[in-house]
Interface confidence: low
């Protein structure tokens, strides 16, 4: 189809080569087309469209993005050519950064149902750059935390080195939708809830003598408990002898309950003590069996091919540890009788 | 069909207490929406009472002169909203609607209950 | 709290003729408004949101204009089941809750 008859927006990416980070682009479809094809009245007397950035009603999904080769080639369907970019209705997800991400995607609606809609298109010019500007070491990072129950910020990355004052008007989205009231480099959350969470999107305008561009970045934010002042407790095993039948296989299970903490570092082993020697047991990897905000349940177990006489004198110790402290549970093996 | 019903409202007494009810049918009280109360004294316009966030968190917001008097409740499992009303006062004779408001930029109240009506009277 | 004050307050008007009632907003709202319609005994209806979008179900002859502070709602001709009161109403919402502010109304009756 004919592209010169859509409208064009231009986007900048500047990304940071020291973390992930991804992008997204909105189906923003003009206007005059947005209400004509957009808003079709598909809907029951009882509903109403959401506001959103871009589509709005029944139609979320009934568009196409295609890329643009830079050689003139003909427009290649994103879902066919490009796996590290998704489609989640009218939003183009890039999961991975990257300067190949240049270039030109357009989005249409896929039913033209007149003649009306064969313009009913937007083109946007998307430059991907690398971050070069070393003076602001300590840009806001694409994933931020609230922590729940207190109030918190949550920062527009490509901005944070600016203050408040200095920074240009913001458009803010949260998971798509325009956030009408937020305009500044900063939104100042009054009291953190589980809602909070999601991914943010935030635009402004940067201009030179030759044109202008919606500079934008996205921001995961996650919403946290306050980190545990608790050492993690062990639920499994409990008893600290356990009956067995010697020459049969064994596997013991050490469950832990580990409490909610950012920087999550959390520690299961198992260990022998014979006599006077102790040494660390080389056990199948740690699995998390349950994860909730507050806290997270972790096992990890040990394998006895057979159970020998030997066994019956060693203590097995599981050992967890998290930045508070360690707890330890110890298990001697006795022989099953009759 | 997706609705809301009140009821509740009552003749009492200055000084005394009500609750009123609200069933949401066709939907659920558990997702990305607010529900809220509004009122309308007799003969007035409408104004903003209390709103419940549906989400797991509940939370709650209340206009500056319903804080301490009027709490804002919600059972999922009886997909019930409730307004209590402490302390009531003549000027709080009017009809209460529940209705519900989808957070999104440019929301509206699209959805609204008959009305039931409290009057406080001695 | 955004404050909005709607005028006139009542309107006496004919069938036929063009009506229209303002609401303004203490502070910039963009285009997050609504107006509602009430007739004597129901619950309000939506006509407008977005400022100048149309509800599903509601008649053309109704639209709605305006953005920043200053907002317009205009019955182009208007029927013998427009005579009711108007309310116009706030719609923001940010990442904090925003109390959704009604005007005062507009009382639409027979001259």
């Known amino acids: 189809f004919n592209i010169s008859g859509c409208s064009t927006k231009k986007l900048l990416w500047t990304y940071s080569t020291r973390s992930e980070e991804e992008f997204v682009l909105f189906c923003d479809l003009p206007e005059p087309q947005k209400s004509h094809f957009c808003h079709r009245n598909r809907l029951s007397p009882k509903q109403v469209p959401e506001h959103l950035p871009f589509m709005g009603s029944n139609d979320l999904s009934d568009v196409q993005w295609y890329q643009q080769p830079s050689n003139g080639d003909p427009l290649e369907d994103i879902r066919k050519s490009y796996p590290h970019i998704i489609q989640d209705k009218c939003t183009l997800h890039f999961l991975t950064p990257g300067v190949n991400n240049s270039g030109s995607y357009i989005c249409r609606p896929k039913m033209i149902k007149s003649p009306y809609d064969v313009a009913c298109c937007v083109k946007m010019i998307l430059e991907v750059k690398p971050q070069t500007n070393a003076s602001c070491e300590y840009s806001a990072s694409h994933k931020q935390d609230l922590l729940l129950g207190s109030t918190g910020s949550i920062s527009c990355p490509s901005l944070s080195c600016q203050s408040d004052a200095q920074s240009p008007a913001v458009t803010w989205y949260k998971n798509g939708k325009l956030l009408s009231v937020e305009r500044s480099n900063r939104i100042v959350v009054d009291e953190v809830y589980d809602y909070h969470q999601g991914t943010y999107v935030c635009d402004y305008t940067q201009s030179d003598t030759v044109s202008s561009w919606t500079v934008r970045a996205v921001v995961q934010v996650r919403t946290i408990v306050g980190d545990t002042k608790l050492k993690p407790d062990i639920l499994d095993p409990v008893e600290d002898t356990l009956e067995v039948e010697l020459g049969k296989p064994l596997t013991i299970s050490c469950k832990a309950r580990f409490g909610f903490e950012r920087v999550f570092n959390p520690v299961i082993k198992w260990y022998i003590k014979d006599s006077d020697l102790e040494w660390e047991v080389s056990v199948p990897e740690a699995k998390s069996i349950k994860s909730t905000l507050k806290d997270e349940i972790i096992e990890r177990n040990i394998i006895l091919e057979k159970v020998t006489q030997r066994d019956l004198r060693r203590k097995f110790v599981c050992f967890v540890q998290n930045s508070i402290g360690n707890t330890t549970q110890s298990v001697q093996l006795k022989e099953k009788r009759g | 069909e997706v609705q809301l019903e009140e009821s509740g409202g009552d003749l009492v007494q200055p000084g005394g207490s009500l609750r009123l009810s609200c069933a949401a049918s066709?939907?659920?009280?558990?997702?990305?929406?607010?529900i809220c109360w509004v009122r309308q004294a007799p003969g007035k316009g409408l104004e903003w009472v209390a709103c419940?966030?549906?989400?797991?968190?509940?939370?709650?917001y209340y206009a500056s002169w319903a804080k301490g008097r009027f709490t804002i409740s919600r059972d999922t499992s009886k997909n019930t909203l409730y307004l209590q009303m402490n302390s009531l006062r003549a000027e709080d004779t009017a009809v209460y609607f529940c209705v519900r408001d989808k957070p999104a930029g440019g929301s509206s109240y699209t959805l609204w209950g008959q009305g039931t009506l409290v009057t406080v009277s001695s | 709290d955004i404050q909005m004050t709607q005028s006139p307050s009542s309107l006496s008007a004919s069938v036929g003729d063009r009506v229209t009632i303002t609401c303004q907003a203490s502070?910039?709202?963009?285009?997050?408004l609504a107006w509602y319609q009430q007739k004597p005994g129901q619950a309000p209806k939506l006509l407008i949101y977005?400022?100048?979008k149309l509800a599903s179900g509601v008649p053309s002859r109704f639209s709605g204009s305006g953005s920043g502070t200053d907002f317009t709602l205009t019955i182009s001709s208007l029927q013998p089941e427009d005579f009711a009161t108007y309310y116009c109403?706030?719609?923001?919402?940010?990442?904090?809750?925003?109390?959704?502010?009604f005007g005062g109304g507009t009382k639409v009756v027979i001259k």
């Open positions: 066709g939907f659920s009280f558990n997702g990305n929406y607010y």
């Open positions: 977005q400022a100048s």
């Open positions: 419940i966030y549906a989400g797991s968190s509940g939370s709650t």
């Open positions: 502070e910039d709202i963009e285009s997050y």
């Open positions: 109403q706030s719609t923001l919402y940010g990442v904090n809750f925003v109390p959704n502010v």
